[in-house]
Amino acid sequence: AYRPSETLCGGELVDTLQFVCGDRGFYFSRPASRVSRRSRGIVEECCFRSCDLALLETYCATPAKSE
């Protein structure tokens, strides 16, 4: 389970993104950002610093469908 506001790195970060984003999928750099393709957007934010659930969700690929 995701523990808020912690450092997440490597496979643990990938697992957490899969958990948070589910079927939506995810990416490591937001498409709208000016960060280069190989720059580690979420890695810098979540591994080298710390991140919360809201920040993680910004890296999910598509918005969750509302029922």
Epitope: G10, G11, S36, R38, S39, V43, E44, C47, F48
Partner: antibody, heavy 122, light 107 residues
């Protein structure tokens, strides 16, 4: 040629300081996270510190936290390790290592320097 | 921290032999496992990442397997240049820990 070249090692007394450098060439240094890994004589490999591609984030092993500082100058394609309050147990060969990119969502050190020896002794 | 335990610590073998080194993680690390080769006085060299993916330029006699907590590195037919020390490393979480190494010697 793609390579990393460390320098700055040497003999230093306990409590002393040393600054290691790692010059990168042959690749776009500024897009890779970088690392320092050390190896005490006759021992195994130990991760020491990591720095994000921008230099905005850093991580340290508990054994060096508060004593070592990792930094980088992307304009000079150079990685640094400032080592203060050195102890005998810091004696090791220090390697700089490049992190993999995120193309496969896996992490590994795909390029290593030849290492520089740091000896802490009175 | 995740502890990585390699076995055996040392191994004697002959050219042409098939050799397997194992690595065990103290926690489930999925397939976030790398293998490195190091020769005396040289820097480590990446052989395998993601448990089983061969790094570019590494001979196909090297192969990796496993998932979760148990992993292996196999050399199908030892060559003279393969005598070295081998390390496993997990990249599931920080700190990225290494195994203690397996020294592969000539019998």
């Amino acid at each position: 040629e793609v390579q990393l070249l460390e320098s700055g090692g040497g003999l230093v007394q306990p409590g002393g300081s040393l600054r290691l450098s790692c010059a990168a060439s042959g690749f776009t240094f500024s897009v890779y996270d970088m690392n320092w890994v050390r190896q005490a004589p006759g021992k195994g490999l130990e991760w020491v510190s990591s720095i994000s591609s921008s230099g905005g984030g850093t991580l340290y092993a508990d054994s060096v936290k508060g004593r070592f500082t990792i930094s980088r100058d992307n304009s000079k394609n150079t990685l640094y390790l400032q080592m203060n309050s050195l102890r005998a147990e810091d004696t090791a060969v220090y390697y700089c290592a490049r992190d993999s990119d995120t193309s496969s969502y896996y992490w590994y050190y795909d390029l290593w320097g030849r290492g520089t020896l740091v000896t802490v002794s009175s | 921290d995740i502890q990585m335990t390699q076995s055996p610590s040392s191994l004697s073998a002959s050219v042409g032999d098939r050799v397997t080194i194992t690595c065990q993680a103290s926690h489930d690390i999925s397939n976030y496992l790398n293998w490195y080769q190091q020769k005396p006085g040289k820097a480590p060299k990446l052989l395998i990442y993601a448990a089983s993916r061969l790094q570019s330029g590494v001979p196909s006699r090297f192969s990796g397997g496993g998932s979760g907590t148990d992993f292996s590195l196999t050399i199908s037919s030892l060559q003279a240049e393969d005598f070295a020390t081998y390390y496993c490393q997990q990249s599931y979480s920080f700190p990225r820990t290494f195994g203690q190494g397996t020294n592969l010697e000539i019998k």
